[in-house]
């Protein structure tokens, strides 16, 4: 009775329970009643990262540097390469084929999570007691002076995008 | 019993292409790939590629990419190869050979074709 | 490409003599294979999978190792053994063979 369905790492063909090739490898010749499956190592530039019966294997994704992309992670014959990209540039989809520039947080907005390779700037607004008057991709909203440590008066409030002015106290004559 | 068995010695003129075969008896030749082994004068062996008989689909050593040309012809159970552009460099014993019925090793060669490049 | 590297490239044993003849691999390999070649003849499969001997080799041949580092061991030299070995890997592609051991008798 020819089998319907196989085992774990194996294939159905002509009747017959196949193994499948290993990961870094791909399928040359099917196995017969007398013979194993054939597989060949994939070449340095491709990869295959299951157990399969695929006759050509996968290219290794390529990181353009022309689209700001550079190497994370070399690939291996089982594993793609992994991209990232270059300093000051993060993915514009969770498949990094390309990068953009970090956003930089506008005054008034202060740097609450700093970009990464694969994130983009997180900007807040700066609440009340913090200011931001440069447009930034890594500031925070930084405190207003305190006036009173300085023995100072606030001679002109603060904002959100400026800092407090301080003067000295009116002195009585 | 398994045989390949290969064309016979070549004598050609650098810049041309030559073309040699590899008949496979003894054994359903669809069920192995053949692969391409040249042994240069220094006697060193070095793979050239693999062609799967039954899918036709070829791998070659990136060496040799440009160089050589698998094909099959399954109604002859004959693999070729082709070598172009030759130059004294391609002088060498070609063989064939294929894996054993079971593991990754080459259990069976060709007897070998002896290409010589000279003007 | 994983490079193999055999040593030494020539020797020469008398008969009764061990010899060993090691193959070491750029990059770890999960067997090693070994073909012996005699003058104006195609390689033989000699050993595989790292210590199998192929059909019809004497028992006198043995092969061990792993990772990168492999070898072929005679544990008493005769005269037919003299040949050149060649250890090849068929983990990575291209598949790579050693540059050969020429055993000679002395």
């Known amino acids: 009775e020819p089998p319907t369905a196989c085992r774990e790492k194996q294939y159905l063909i002509n009747s017959q329970c196949c193994s499948l090739c290993q990961p870094g490898q791909k399928l040359v010749s099917d196995c017969t009643e007398f013979t194993e499956t054939e597989c060949l190592p994939c070449s340095e530039s491709e990869f295959l990262d299951t157990w399969n019966r695929e006759t050509r294997c996968h290219q290794h994704k390529y990181c353009d540097p022309n689209l700001g992309l550079r190497v994370q992670q070399k690939g291996t014959s089982e594993t793609d390469t992994i991209c990232t990209c270059e300093e000051g540039l993060h993915c514009m989809s969770e498949s990094c084929e390309s990068c953009v520039p970090h956003r930089s947080c506008l005054p008034g907005f202060g740097v609450k999570q700093i970009a990464t390779g694969v994130s983009d700037t997180i900007c807040e607004p700066c609440p009340v007691g913090f200011f931001s008057n440069v447009s930034s991709a890594f500031e925070k909203c930084r405190p207003w002076t305190s006036c009173e440590t300085k023995d100072l008066v606030v001679q002109q409030a603060g904002t959100n995008k400026t800092d407090v002015v301080c003067g000295p106290q009116d002195r009585q004559r | 019993q398994v045989q390949l068995q290969q064309s016979g010695a070549e004598l050609v003129r650098p810049g041309v292409s030559v073309k040699i075969s590899c008949k496979g008896s003894?054994?359903?030749?669809?069920?192995?790939?053949i692969h391409w082994v040249k042994q240069s004068h220094a006697r060193r062996l070095e793979w050239i590629g693999a062609?799967?008989?039954?899918?036709?689909?070829?791998t070659y050593n990136q060496k040799f990419k440009g160089k050589a040309t698998m094909t099959v012809d399954k109604s002859s159970s004959t693999a070729y190869m082709e070598l172009a552009r030759l130059t004294s460099e391609d002088s060498a014993i070609y063989y064939c050979?294929?894996?054993?019925?079971?593991?990754?090793?080459?259990?069976?060669w060709g007897q070998g074709t002896l290409v010589t490049v000279s003007a | 490409d994983i490079e193999l590297t055999q040593s030494p490239a020539i020797m020469s044993a008398s008969p009764g003599e061990k010899v060993t003849i090691t193959c070491s691999a750029s990059s770890s390999v999960s067997y090693m294979h070994w073909f012996q070649q005699k003058p104006g003849t195609s390689p033989k499969l000699w050993i595989y999978s790292t210590s199998n001997l192929a059909s019809g080799v004497p028992v006198r041949f043995s092969g061990s190792g792993s990772g990168t580092s492999y070898s072929l061991t005679i544990s008493s030299m005769e005269a037919e053994d003299a040949a050149t070995y060649y250890c090849?890997?068929?983990?990575?592609?291209?598949?790579?063979f050693g540059a050969g051991t020429k055993l000679e008798l002395k």
């Open positions: 062609i799967s008989t039954n899918y036709g689909a070829a």
């Open positions: 090849h890997q068929y983990h990575r592609s291209p598949l790579t």
């Open positions: 003894g054994y359903t030749f669809t069920d192995h790939a």
């Open positions: 050979a294929r894996r054993g019925s079971h593991g990754d090793w080459f259990a069976y």
